[in-house]
Interface confidence: low
């Protein structure tokens, strides 16, 4: 009897045979007839003759990727009644081998990606009554193979990405009632017919990224089960009101890298499963979007608009928000963010904010990062940060502060105050037990972190006159002990980098004289 595993292949006890990358020019012989999985990918098999696999009646998985295959005999795969997976990607096929695959009634997954396929014969997928996954991406298709796809009512995932498709006709996928995932990214799609997605009642993921769409794809209204929608990197300028009215289950929308100028105020309302919303550079938008019914947002980014105010009830409705980026707008007044308990990051840089009230950030018990830089802030209430127990990074640089409250900021790792030229008071190191990085308006304000404060270990200027860093021992004083352990850092020492440096020729003694 022939050996169970013929050289140069390797076999395991699970009836799997690996002959990949062995320089084979033909299907290997001498293998067990009971083989269930055969991997002959990455070889030099350029054609498959008739009955190439007649000795493998129990084959369930056949991998033929990366072989420069250009010809498959119509009867090359005959007899493979158990075959569930067939991978033919990265070959030289110019057409779908419709005859060869016709009898594969058990086939569930078919990979034809990364070939040179320009045509899909009308009868291509007839008889594939169990096919669930079909890869046709990275070929040279210029249109959706509408008729062949109509043979696949069991299909769950289809990718036609990375082709040269320029338009999609009405009812292109109408028979694919089981389809859950459809990838059409990286084509040249300029237009979608109004009814092109009709019949895709179970579609959950639609990827239209990297195409040439210049209008919002209204055809998505026919997709009631849609959860993930991508149309980033297109040429869409307007998202109309009611854009997603037919897609109440949307969880994710990727729309960045579109030249958006306008977004309908109610475009994103009633999307109760939406977790993330990113709108950048919609320069004609003046009002904060109506997010009524869209109550599970975890991340909201609205930047580069003309929005001048934030709704007072934002945090009554958006209790799940973790990150909020409202930078580069015209916001003047801030509401109380109380209620946004999960908020960890807020960016409000480059707005027109002038005042931070005591209640503005109250209740943000999870806030870690707050960026208020490049506003017009003149005053921050003394208790504004008092309850921000977790804040580690605070940027209030380039504002108009004359004083700066430190209550509640004991856990800061990074603080930026540079550019507040009316802020002349010295800071006390004991107020910042965990500080690693500090930027201040004036060099002398670094001195307290350079060796003046009793909390800090003196690091004399002989050691490193240029690099104004100081090593602070944890637990050096009772004050430090009160904030030690896990509410502080993992290391026993922390290096503080403070800018602007006083420099070698203007040490702290020179800047502060006898005060030191």
């Amino acid at each position: 009897a022939p050996p169970l595993c013929a050289a140069p292949c390797s076999c395991d006890g699970d009836r799997r045979v690996d002959c990949s990358g062995k320089g084979l020019t033909a299907v290997p012989e001498g293998l067990s007839a009971f083989t269930q999985a055969l991997d002959i990918s990455m070889n030099n098999i350029t054609q498959l003759p008739e009955d190439a696999f007649k000795n493998f009646p129990f084959l369930e998985e056949l991998q033929l990727a990366g072989n420069d295959l250009s010809f498959i005999h119509p009867k090359a795969l005959s007899g493979l009644k158990e075959l569930k997976v067939l991978t033919l990607q990265n070959n030289q096929l110019k057409t779908v081998p419709s005859e060869a695959i016709r009898g594969l009634s058990a086939l569930q997954s078919l990979r034809l990606d990364a070939n040179h396929i320009t045509s899909v014969p009308e009868d291509s997928f007839e008889g594939l009554v169990q096919l669930r996954h079909l890869w046709l991406d990275d070929n040279i298709l210029t249109e959706v193979p509408v008729r062949p796809l109509s043979n696949l009512p069991t299909l769950q995932a289809l990718t036609l990405a990375l082709n040269n498709i320029s338009s999609i006709p009405d009812f292109a996928f109408t028979n694919l009632s089981s389809l859950v995932v459809l990838h059409l990214h990286n084509n040249k799609i300029k237009s979608l017919s109004q009814h092109c997605f009709d019949g895709l009642d179970n579609l959950e993921t639609l990827d239209l990224n990297y195409n040439n769409l210049d209008e919002f794809p209204q055809a998505i209204k026919a997709l009631p089960s849609l959860k993930e929608l991508g149309f980033h990197s297109n040429s869409i300028s307007v998202i109309p009101d009611g854009a997603f009215a037919g897609n109440p289950l949307l969880r994710t929308i990727h729309l960045y890298d579109n030249p958006l100028s306008f977004v309908g105020n109610s475009a994103f309302h009633n999307l109760s499963d939406l977790h993330s919303l990113v709108i950048r550079g919609a320069s004609l938008v003046q009002w904060f979007p109506n997010l009524a019914g869209t109550v599970h947002l975890e991340s909201l980014t609205l930047t580069g608009t003309k929005i001048s105010s934030i709704p007072d009830d934002l945090c009554q409705n958006q209790k799940m928000l973790r990150t909020l980026d409202l930078s580069y707008n015209d916001i003047r007044d801030l509401p109380s963010f109380n209620g946004c308990r999960a908020l960890e990051e807020i960016s409000l840089q480059r707005n027109q904010i002038s005042l931070i009230k005591e209640t503005t950030f109250q209740g943000l018990t999870s806030l870690r990062i707050l960026d208020l830089s490049r506003n017009l802030i003149r005053e921050i209430h003394s208790g504004a940060f008092a309850k921000l127990g977790t804040i580690t990074n605070l940027d209030v640089s380039f504002n108009e502060l004359t004083s700066f409250p430190t209550e509640g900021l004991n856990g800061l790792n990074q603080l930026k105050l540079v550019g507040n030229f009316q802020l002349k008071d010295a800071l006390a190191a004991r107020d910042f037990a965990n500080l690693r990085s500090l930027s201040v308006p004036y060099a002398y304000q670094c001195c307290a972190f350079w060796g003046c404060d009793s909390y800090a270990n003196l690091n004399t200027e002989d050691n490193s006159p240029q690099d104004h860093s100081v090593t602070k021992e944890k637990g050096a004083t009772d004050a430090a002990n009160a904030t030690s352990t896990a509410e502080s850092e993992e290391h026993s020492q922390i290096i503080i980098h403070c800018t602007p440096s006083t420099g070698a020729f203007k040490p702290c003694e020179y800047l502060l004289g006898s005060w030191m």
Partner: antibody, heavy 119, light 106 residues
Framework: QVQLQQSGAELVKPGSSVKISCKAS????????IHWIKQQPGNGLEWIGW????????EYNQKFNGKATFIADKSSSTADMQLNSLTSEDSAVYFC????????????WGQGTLVTVSS | DIQMTQSPPVLSASVGDRVTLSCKAS??????LDWYHQKHGEAPKLLIY???NLQTGIPSRFSGSGSGTDYTLIISSLQPEDVATYYC????????FGTGTKLELK
């Protein structure tokens, strides 16, 4: 040094209520969150919720809504948890723990209070 | 709720061994994870916070790593006093503890 001292073990009847105390010392009581954690015999840990003594703000794990109620007394630096409508499922050790933020790490723990519900 | 599955449930190792404990989340928890150990009859004790930060006073033989859904606690050289049940804890949303790994001496 920071300490969380919990009240003693309780033996209570089904249907009744019980109040467990957690007395804090060695730090500013109003500046940290007090969390409550449940551990049934031989089982893992389950987060019940927290109270911020500074303003009495609370948050509960949905599973314990209506079962647990937190209160904090600033004057005595004590946090209490009341458990209502007790059943055998509530028999467990209950821990209080301190954190600087609403959810993150618990650097200090009480020693635990055993509650036994039995008729 | 996010489920936290620890493996193995029970682990036997010898003094001096390098021990690896695993914690898998049912979804991405963005490194919002701590490790605790609990000795019999005692309260849990914090070892590692925010995935890889060693709590003050904890020996450096303990270290943590991970991202996304997969997290690991390593004890580089097991000591007798490390015998305990180890719990991971995620606070990315709706805080939950892991199922626990009981570490025993061989």
């Amino acid at each position: 040094q920071v300490q969380l001292q919990q009240s003693g073990a309780e033996l209570v009847k089904p249907g009744s209520s019980v109040k467990i105390s957690c007395k804090a010392s060695g730090y500013t009581f109003t500046s940290y969150f007090i969390h409550w954690i449940k551990q049934q015999p031989g089982n893992g840990l389950e987060w019940i919720g927290w109270i911020y003594p500074g303003d009495g703000d609370t948050e509960y794990n949905q599973k314990f809504n209506g079962k647990a109620t937190f209160i904090a007394d600033k004057s005595s630096s004590t946090a209490d948890m009341q458990l209502n409508s007790l059943t055998s499922e509530d028999s467990a050790v209950y821990f209080c723990a301190r954190s600087k933020s609403a959810y993150n790490w618990f650097a200090y723990w009480g020693q635990g209070t055993l509650v036994t519900v039995s008729s | 709720d996010i489920q936290m599955t620890q493996s193995p449930p029970v682990l036997s190792a010898s003094v001096g061994d390098r021990v690896t404990l695993s914690c898998k989340a049912s979804q991405n928890i963005n490194k919002n994870l701590d490790w605790y150990h609990q000795k019999h009859g005692e309260a849990p004790k914090l070892l590692i916070y925010y995935t890889n930060n060693l709590q003050t006073g904890i020996p450096s033989r303990f270290s943590g790593s991970g991202s996304g859904t997969d997290y690991t606690l390593i004890i580089s050289s097991l000591q007798p006093e490390d015998v305990a049940t180890y719990y991971c804890y995620q606070y990315n949303s709706g805080p939950t503890f892991g199922t626990g790994t009981k570490l025993e001496l061989k």
